[in-house]
Interface confidence: low
Amino acid sequence: SQPQAVPPYASENQTCRDQEKEYYEPQHRICCSRCPPGTYVSAKCSRIRDTVCATCAENSYNEHWNYLTICQLCRPCDPVMGLEEIAPCTSKRKTQCRCQPGMFCAAWALECTHCELLSDCPPGTEAELKDEVGKGNNHCVPCKAGHFQNTSSPSARCQPHTRCENQGLVEAAPGTAQSDTTCKNPLEPLPPEMSGTMLM
C-alpha cells in the first residue's frame, strides 16, 4: 500500500486527504496542516515546511482545527441581554452562556443573543416542563384533576389538593384548579346560623 502523505504534500485536485486537519493552500498547490483547537497559525506553510502553530494568548480561543492567523477574543455573557455565564472561556472554547433564571432565549444567531422574561402562567395553570431550560417561552397548561395553582407566576407548579381526612378534618369546600380544598374541624359542631362558615 502507498505510504500516507505527510503535509505539506502536492495536491492536483485541490482536495486534501484529511479535511478536518488539513487544508488546501492554492498559492503553492499543496495540502498543509491546520492548527489544532487552542492554537493559531504563527507561520504559514511552504513547499518545504508545514504550518507552524502557536497557543492562543490568554482571553482568546480557537474552537476548531483551523488555519486562522489570529485567535478569537473571549467575550463575556451580556447581562443586559439577559445572559449569564455557565462556563468560562478557555483557549479551546468560547464563554458558555445561558439565559438568566426566569428568562428564555428570544433571539438566536448560531447561539442565544437575547433573553426575555418568561410569561406568567395564570391561576389554574402551570408552565409545561421543557427538555431544556431557557429554550422557549412558557406554554401554560391547565392543572390536572385534583391539583391547583393560585398565583400568576412564570414558575409556580400545580399542587395536589389537601386531603382533609389525612389531617383528621372534613371537607368544607372542594378544591378547584385555582384553589385548595377548604377543611374544617368535625369535632366542633357549629351553631345552625353559622353552619359551614367556621373554617380552619
Epitope: M103, A107, E116, L117, S119, D120, P122, S152, S153, P154
Partner: nanobody, 112 residues
Framework: EVQLVESGGGLVQPGGSLRLSCKAS????????FGWYRQAPGKQRELVAT???????WYDVSVKGRFIISRDNPENTVYLQMNSLRPEDTAVYYC??????WGQGTLVTVSS
Amino acid sequence: EVQLVESGGGLVQPGGSLRLSCKASGTTFSDRAFGWYRQAPGKQRELVATISTAGLTWYDVSVKGRFIISRDNPENTVYLQMNSLRPEDTAVYYCNTFRGNWGQGTLVTVSS
C-alpha cells in the same frame, strides 16, 4: 415598532428621592415585562429592576429596599421610585421591554 420614553431624571442630593417614568406606545403594554437599566459613565449597562406582566418584581442587590418598580397598565407606564439615593446611583436610566427596544434614557445625578 415599540416606542419608550423615559422621564423624571434630574439632580438630587444624597438621601433624596426621584420617581422615573417610562411611557410605552406601539405595544400591548399589559403583555410585556419591563425592566429598568442604568449605565454609569465608563461602565457597562446593568439591570436594576424588573416587573413581570403580573406585577412580580425583581431587584438588583445594590438597590433592593431603596427602589420600587411598579406599572400602571391603563396608563401604559412603568415607574421606578428611587429613595435614599447615593452618589453611586448616578447614571443614565433606561427602560426596556426585553425585546430589544430601548428609550433615550433619563439622567440621574446624585451629588451634594
